[in-house]
């Protein structure tokens, strides 16, 4: 008796839903009375499905209302675990344990990404020096580097600072500021850069005509 996994690594997005799967051999019709399926994430119990009944009493509180075994898949030899509203804390090594005549288990690693998609921006000016402060703020995970470039997409020199804090959902709240001498209609870009391909997000900041503090813009591309 052997359990197999179509994939042993899932990379999922924060807030999305995921379904992870373990396959087991079923000949003809499934005998629910003989089937035991356990899903665990490290020392947390997620699913205990024993002889056709799910025992919710033992389910870890962090998975309550979010995790379910797709029972219609069992007859196909597929023990599929669905988790909704994926959180950063859902990252880790999962295990499906299946007993159906014999017993076996497999591990599945889940990684959770939160792209820095929504970039908030602000521009302010010091009337005494005409120095502009450009600020970009976004939430995501894991750590991102903020890169400032000009309209030619060349790095910009200037005094910069970065602050990072944690949100309630354990995302990283990254705020980067850049102080530069600039004139009206100059264009700057802040890019939240991550090493994985397709994980970079950029906002465009245009120096306004008036030397005043402007409300946050949300233009991104």
């Amino acid at each position: 008796f052997t359990v197999t996994v179509p994939k042993d690594l899932y990379v999922v997005e924060y807030g999305s839903n995921m379904t992870i799967e373990c396959k087991f051999p079923v000949e003809k019709q499934l005998d629910l009375a003989a089937l035991i399926v356990y899903w665990e994430m490290e020392d947390k119990n997620i699913i205990q499905f024993v002889h056709g009944e799910e025992d919710l009493k033992v389910q870890h509180s962090s998975y309550r209302q979010r995790a379910r075994l797709l029972k219609d898949q069992l007859s196909l030899g597929n023990a599929a675990l669905q988790i909704t509203d994926v959180k950063l804390q859902d990252a880790g090594v999962y295990r499906c344990m299946i007993s159906y005549g014999g017993a076996d288990y497999k591990r599945i690693t889940v990684k959770v990404n939160a792209p820095y998609r929504k970039i908030n921006q602000r521009i302010s000016v010091d009337p005494a020096t005409s120095e502009h402060e450009l600020i970009c703020q976004a939430e995501g995970y894991p750590e991102a580097e903020v890169i400032w470039t000009n309209s030619d997409h060349q790095p910009v020199s200037g005094k910069r600072s970065v602050t990072t804090s944690r949100t309630e959902g354990m995302l990283l709240n990254v705020t980067s500021s850049l102080r530069v001498n600039a004139t009206a209609n100059d264009v700057f870009y802040c890019t939240f850069w991550r090493s994985q391909p397709g994980q970079n997000h950029t906002a465009e900041l245009i120096i306004p005509e008036l030397p005043a503090t402007h409300p946050p813009q949300n233009r991104t591309h």
Epitope: Y38, M97, A103, Y105, R107
Partner: antibody, heavy 117, light 107 residues
Framework: QVQLKESGPGLVAPSQSLSITCTVS????????ISWIRQPPGKGLEWLGA???????NYNSAFMSRLSISKDNSKSQVFLKMNSLQTDDTAIYYC???????????WGQGTSVTVSS | DIQMNQSPSSLSASLGDTITITCHAS??????LSWYQQKPGNIPKLLIY???NLHTGVPSRFSGSGSGTGFTLTISSLQPEDIATYYC?????????FGGGTKLEIK
């Protein structure tokens, strides 16, 4: 803190059976697997079998016919039973916490078993 | 069963030396490889889990590397208390299997 403690007979006559109890504290058997490992005098480590959180077991094929592992979650106890012992079963027998996502992180102090008439 | 080939079987080194012990698996282990230290007359203790992660309380002079079928345990700046036998163990599949051990002695 996490502890595992084996209790066994010490001496077993050839062809007789061996029963060892492992009592754990500081964690629950519903959250961690337990493996049994033995070490003959002056030799290396040999994995005998494991019992999973859900009660499923897996045995080293070399011992499958004469080894049985069970547990009582409520008493925090794991039991090893091995039949038909011979002199080459003389060893220190360890119970070990063996989380599937980590490694064998906590070991009992071991119980010495001598098979002799 | 996955065979674990550990070398050398014994090793003599001087205090302050850096030594390496290797473990070769007959099948792909991904990162499911652990290293244990057993001092004379003592129980085995976990040093490294998942190929390269230091277990709590283990000195940083111990390090592990590798993935797939080839793995290495490195001890830098050898100390007298490092005299022990070292074992690798695969956790990729059942039955769990150990390397034959490397007995480390101080010159």
């Amino acid at each position: 803190q996490v502890q595992l403690k084996e209790s066994g007979p010490g001496l077993v006559a050839p062809s007789q059976s061996l029963s060892i109890t492992c009592t754990v504290s500081g964690f629950s058997l519903t959250s961690y697997d337990i493996s049994w490992i033995r070490q003959p005098p002056g030799k290396g480590l040999e994995w005998l079998g494991a019992i999973w959180t859900g009660g499923g077991t897996n045995y080293n094929s070399a011992f499958m016919s004469r080894l049985s592992i069970s547990k009582d979650n409520s008493k925090s106890q794991v039991f090893l039973k091995m039949n038909s012992l011979q002199t080459d079963d003389t060893a220190i027998y360890y119970c070990v916490r063996d989380p599937y996502y980590y490694a064998m992180d906590y070991w009992g102090q071991g119980t010495s078993v001598t098979v002799s008439s | 069963d996955i065979q674990m080939n550990q070398s050398p079987s014994s090793l003599s080194a001087s205090l302050g030396d850096t030594i390496t012990i290797t473990c070769h698996a007959s099948q792909n282990l991904n990162v499911w490889l652990s290293w244990y230290q057993q001092k004379p007359g003592n129980i085995p203790k976990l040093l490294i889990y998942k190929a390269s992660n230091l277990h709590t309380g283990v000195p940083s002079r111990f390090s592990g590397s590798g993935s797939g079928t080839g793995f290495t345990l490195t001890i830098s700046s050898l100390q007298p208390e490092d005299i022990a036998t070292y074992y690798c163990q695969q956790g990729q599949s059942y039955p769990r299997t150990f390397g034959g051990g490397t007995k480390l002695e101080i010159k």
